[in-house]
Structures are given as C-alpha cells and as structure tokens.
C-alpha cells in the first residue's frame, strides 16, 4: 500500500477546522475490516485518531478529530481537526496498514491574522516641529510572530529608533508593540505595517501630524 499526503504544509486559521489529507489506493475487493489506520503526532508519537478492527476508534486528541467514514473505503484516510489551536501546530503522521504498511507525514501550520494596529502618540498635544515624539503601534492576537515596518509619508522606510516587542498571550497568540521615536517635521504621516509572514497579510496603521488635531 502506498500512502500519499500533500508535501506543502496545511495552513489553518485559529478556531477554524482543518483537513490533513492522506490517501491510499485500495486493491479490488478491499474492505474496511482489513484496514488499520493510525494518525499520530510525528515528534512525540502521541496517538491522535485511529481506525482498527473495522471501526472508528475515535479521537485520542482532545476530542476534536474525525475521519471521513464514508470515504475510507475509497482510500481517503484524511483527518479533520476541529477548532484549530496554536498548540495543534506541527507534523502529523498517517499510518495505513492493510496487508503491508506505509506512512507519510503532513505539516500543519497554524495562523491568525493580526488586528488593525492602534496608534498612540506621546506627547499628544502642543506638538511643534523639532519635538521628539514617541509613536506606538500595537496589533493583537496574531500568529505566528510578526514583522513590523515603519514608513514616513513618502514611503521611505524608518528603521532607526524603532523598538519592537512581542509577547505570547494565554492562547499562544502574539501581541506586538512597536515604538518609533522620531523628530517631528512641519507635518508628516507615519505608517506602521504589521505583517503575518504565513498569511502574507499586512495590517496597516498610520498617524498624521499637521499641528492640531491629530489624525489616526
């Protein structure tokens, strides 16, 4: 028996369902009584889900997994993972045994989009050209780690005097805070872009300083 999985990682958004595809080519006359199917975590060998002795043995992994029982006889051994969490990320191995045995591993890459950045300014009043200001760009609940890029109103990258920090919250999602210290010109726009490298998603925030009032 030959097991086939997708070579590319499966990208799944947090809190959505993901399908880890695995297939085999059943011989003529194949019956499910002959099938032993095991899904396990590749690194730790922890059992995730199994089908043995002609029946679905159920989820051994936080009761969030399911097979496609009607499709098994056609050679579809895919695994459905419900309500994906950050901790589900990793490699999963699909083992299929009929008369002989084969296995293959598929990677699950978890992702979550970053929120639209919120921009804060300190100080936020009595601003004059030549003043040093601190602009903070904050974006929340993304995964995996973000990249943050600052630009001025002409699109020129601002790389000096930038301090970025990232922190994983209780769900493993990241909150990112990036601080730009800049000397004000007569007026100007400062933009922050928070990039999720897996989703190729950019979240934008900007602040325009034109005397008073400020525009966010």
């Amino acid at each position: 028996v030959e097991v086939q999985v997708s070579e590319d990682p499966v990208v799944a958004l947090v809190d959505t369902d993901a399908t880890l595809r695995c297939s085999f080519s059943p011989e003529p006359g194949f019956s499910l009584a002959q099938l032993n199917l095991i899904w396990q975590l590749t690194d730790t060998k922890q059992l995730v889900h199994s089908f043995t002795e002609g029946r679905d043995q159920g989820s051994a992994y936080s009761n969030r997994t399911a097979l496609f029982p009607d499709l098994l006889v056609q050679g579809n051994a895919s695994l459905r993972l419900q309500r994906v969490r950050v901790t589900d990320e990793g490699s999963y191995t699909c083992f299929v045994s009929i008369q002989d045995f084969d296995s293959a591993a598929v990677s699950l890459q978890v992702a979550a989009p970053y929120s639209k950045p919120s921009m804060t300014l300190e100080p936020n009043k009595d601003l004059r050209p030549g003043n040093m200001v601190t602009i903070t760009c904050s974006s929340y609940q993304g995964y995996p780690e973000a990249e943050v890029f600052w630009k001025d109103g002409q699109g020129v990258p601002l790389t000096g005097n930038v301090t970025t920090s990232q922190m994983a919250n209780e769900r493993g999602l990241f909150d990112v805070h990036s601080v730009l210290r800049v000397v004000l010109g007569a007026n100007g726009t400062y933009s922050c872009l928070v990039r999720n490298p897996v989703l190729q998603q950019d979240a934008h925030g900007s602040v325009t300083i034109t005397g008073q009032p400020l525009t966010f």
Epitope: E89, Q109, P144, E145, E147, V148, F149, P157, T159, T164, S165, Q166, M167, A168, E170, G172, R195, P197, V198
Partner: antibody
Framework: EVQLLESGGGLVQPGGSLRLSCAAS????????MSWVRQAPGKGLEWVSG?????????YYADSVKGRFTVSRDNSKNTLYLQMNSLRAEDTAVYYC??????????????WGQGTTVTVSS | EIVLTQSPGTLSLSPGERATLSCRAS??????LAWYQQKPGQAPRLLIY???SRATGIPARFSGSGSGTEFTLTISSLQSEDFAVYYC??????????FGGGTKVEIK
Amino acid sequence: EVQLLESGGGLVQPGGSLRLSCAASGFNFSSYWMSWVRQAPGKGLEWVSGISISYGGNAYYADSVKGRFTVSRDNSKNTLYLQMNSLRAEDTAVYYCGRDRSPYQYRSMDVWGQGTTVTVSS
Amino acid sequence: EIVLTQSPGTLSLSPGERATLSCRASQSIRSDLAWYQQKPGQAPRLLIYGASSRATGIPARFSGSGSGTEFTLTISSLQSEDFAVYYCQQYNNWPPLTFGGGTKVEIK
C-alpha cells in the same frame, strides 16, 4: 545536511570593529528567523541579537550591544551578519549563530554553528 | 525582562542516577521554555521545547515539565555522555530572549 558556519572572529583592540558572518546551507534560509548568541569565557549563554525573515527584516538587540552592533541578512547569499563596532573588553566571547526550530517563528534554536571567537584586548 | 533562575548551580551525581534540574521564571511564561545541553568546546544542543516536547533525536531519558513560572528538566538515568551544562531559555516575551545561568551536572 543542515549547517551553519561562522567566520570573521579574531583579536581586535578596544574601540575597534569586526564583522561576523554565518553561512547557512541545507535549508530554506529565507523562511527562518536567525540569532546571534555569545558565551564569554567560563560564563553562560547570552542572547545578542535576532533578525526576522525578510530581506532587511526586523532586528532585535540585547541592551548590552544596542547602538554598537548591527545584525543583517542576505537571503540571496544564505548568509547572516553581525557588524560589531565600538568593541569593549566585555564583548570577548565565542559567538554562535542559531536557527529557529521552525520556519516563521522565533523561539528555540535547534541548529547552531560551531562558534567563532572574538577577543577584545589591547 | 524575564529573568530565569536555575538551580542548583552544580549537581554531583553518579551514572545511572536520576537528575532533576529546576528553572524558575520571574513571571509567567506559559510553556514557552526550551532546555539546552552544552559540553565543553561545543555549541549548545536543543533538548526540549515547549517545556515538555523532546527535540528531534533526543533520547527518551530526557523529559521536561512545568508551566507558568516553575519548570523541571529530568534525566531519568544519567549516562556518561549526559555530564554537561544545561541551560533553560524563555521565548514568551522578547526581546530579549533570556537564558538561565546554567546547571552543571558533574560526575560524583
């Protein structure tokens, strides 16, 4: 084979400069965050700097080197750099480059170079 | 900055004995902790990530546990090649990534 190879270490006077390089092979370099970690003689490990995946990506520094060291990467050459200026005696250490365990993440390092020694002394 | 405190500084044990190493964080870091082994003249080697997951190729005698602020690395039965210095490292809140001061496991 996944490999990191540092070079560029040596003896330099206080106030001097050095540029360390770390050549990567055997993996998709442009998908991995990279780090520099150092170890002073007889001391523990100290994180020095890290850089995100993009060309010209985000750079992060320990307070002890901020303003003096600059990390960069050239994804077309699969190479990580550490430009060290205004070197001090306390920068004397073995410098390691490290690759994160998983692409797109900055957490733990499962691939390390052999280290290159930097000695700052007059 | 999150500070990691490792204890004891030195652990003197005989081959075959069980080693228990501790790492305490100055604030909660969930399970965002790694353990490394380092032998003289060599680069560090990743043992454990996510507080309890063994890295590729690491023998089953190494196990990690804990979450929040208290973490433990256990070597169930010390082999001669396990005598080394062990470091913990957090990646919950950065920069900086921070390492503990290390625990030296030496032959008694």
